[in-house]
């Protein structure tokens, strides 16, 4: 299907209590139903965001309103395509204590890829 699925960045460090949006880009599918997985378990999140870039290119966001210790871990997104599950590169979400200056490291897998959005 020529499906391209990407999550970015590889590592994301945020302050406890801050909001964060994890990004997932899906190319080669119309209207994908993007599922997010954390440490192997599907994350149920009815209010995740989507942006249709074009008919065959969608970006999904897993929106975490207030990051706590329990949210730290390894995230990836997945979509069903022709009966097979396509999986993105994982993103490591790590926390620093509330009030510390968090910074995020990013390693682009695709030149057109955007940074995570931090605004709530």
């Amino acid at each position: 299907a020529g499906l391209k699925l990407m999550g970015a960045p590889v590592k994301l460090t945020v302050s406890q209590g801050q909001p964060v949006k994890l990004n997932c880009s899906v190319e080669g599918m119309e209207e994908p139903d993007i599922q997010w997985v954390k440490d192997g378990a599907v994350v149920q999140n009815l209010d995740q965001l989507y942006i249709p870039v074009s008919e065959q290119h969608w970006i999904g966001f897993l929106s975490l309103k207030s990051v706590e210790r329990s949210d730290a871990g390894r995230y990836w997104c997945q979509v069903e395509d022709g009966g097979e599950t396509e999986i993105s590169q994982p993103v490591w979400l790590t926390l620093v204590p509330r009030g510390s200056s968090a910074h995020h490291h990013h390693h682009h897998h695709h030149s057109a890829w955007s940074h995570p959005q931090f605004e709530k």
């Epitope: 119309e30 209207e31 139903d33 994350v43 149920q44 999140n45 009815l46 209010d47 995740q48 965001l49 989507y50 942006i51 249709p52 970006i59 966001f61 929106s63 975490l64 309103k65 207030s66 706590e68 069903e80 959005q117 605004e119 709530k120």
Partner: antibody
């Protein structure tokens, strides 16, 4: 213009089966989700469930899980709410809602901007 | 199952500030949405993601959230704001939606 046209009011006896429909127009059906909301006479809103754009994922509220089935037909841009066995307590107005609104941050599924007019279901012996 | 708790009624005089609260254990982690329903009509989205005004909603409507409490504020309430207001959010596990019991706002 986004339109959600719901099937007409229905009166049924307890134990009967029923399917009500919601036909969408004015947008690409598979770009959005459909949710169903119940409102009993003189009471508040109750979230029943939601179906994904492809129809591959359904979510149900705990009170409705196993009692109703939500489905969709992409070819006719129609969503359905189905009961196998109605009860008197199912008497209510049922709204279908286009789940998904455009915001500066993207399309938020739980942004319920477009509501159908509602279908009144009366279950009485 | 998860519940959102609202006061059954709030009354204000025209021009006063009306505040409607909604409490739920998951609100520190889940966004609140507010819907207005006038008699005999379908609901209308007023606020999404705690504090963002939906399109076409007057500036006198605002939302906020702190801890387990979300608040809808109507600054300078008008007679036409008289309606039922419902908060809405997602269950702690993120797998179903929940409406609060609703608050009847009277502007007299």
């Amino acid at each position: 213009e986004v339109q959600l046209v719901q099937s007409g009011a229905d009166v049924k006896k307890p134990g009967a089966s029923l399917t009500i429909s919601c036909q969408a127009s004015g947008y690409t059906f598979t770009d959005y989700w459909i949710s169903w909301v119940r409102q009993k006479p003189g009471k508040g809103l109750e979230w029943m469930g939601r179906i994904s754009r492809h129809g591959s994922q359904t979510y149900y509220g705990p009170s409705f899980q196993g009692h109703v089935t939500i489905s969709a037909d992409r070819s006719t841009a129609t969503a359905y709410l189905q009961w196998r066995s109605l009860e008197a307590s199912d008497t209510a107005m049922y709204y279908c809602v286009r789940a998904g609104g455009q915001t500066s941050g993207g399309t938020i599924p739980e942004y319920y901007q477009h509501w159908g007019p509602g279908t009144l279901v009366t279950v009485s012996s | 199952s998860y519940e959102l708790t609202q006061p059954p009624s709030v009354s204000v005089s025209p021009g006063q500030t009306a505040r409607i609260t909604c409490s739920g254990d998951a609100l520190p982690k889940k966004y609140a949405y507010w819907y207005q329903q006038k008699s005999g009509q379908a609901p209308v989205l007023v606020i999404y993601e705690d504090h963002k005004r939906a399109s076409g909603i007057p500036e006198r409507f605002s939302g906020s959230s702190s801890g387990t409490m979300a608040t809808l504020t109507i600054s300078g309430a008008q007679v036409e704001d008289e309606a039922d207001y419902y908060c809405y959010s997602i269950s702690p596990a993120g797998n179903y939606g929940v409406f609060g019991g609703g608050t009847k706002l009277t502007v007299l």
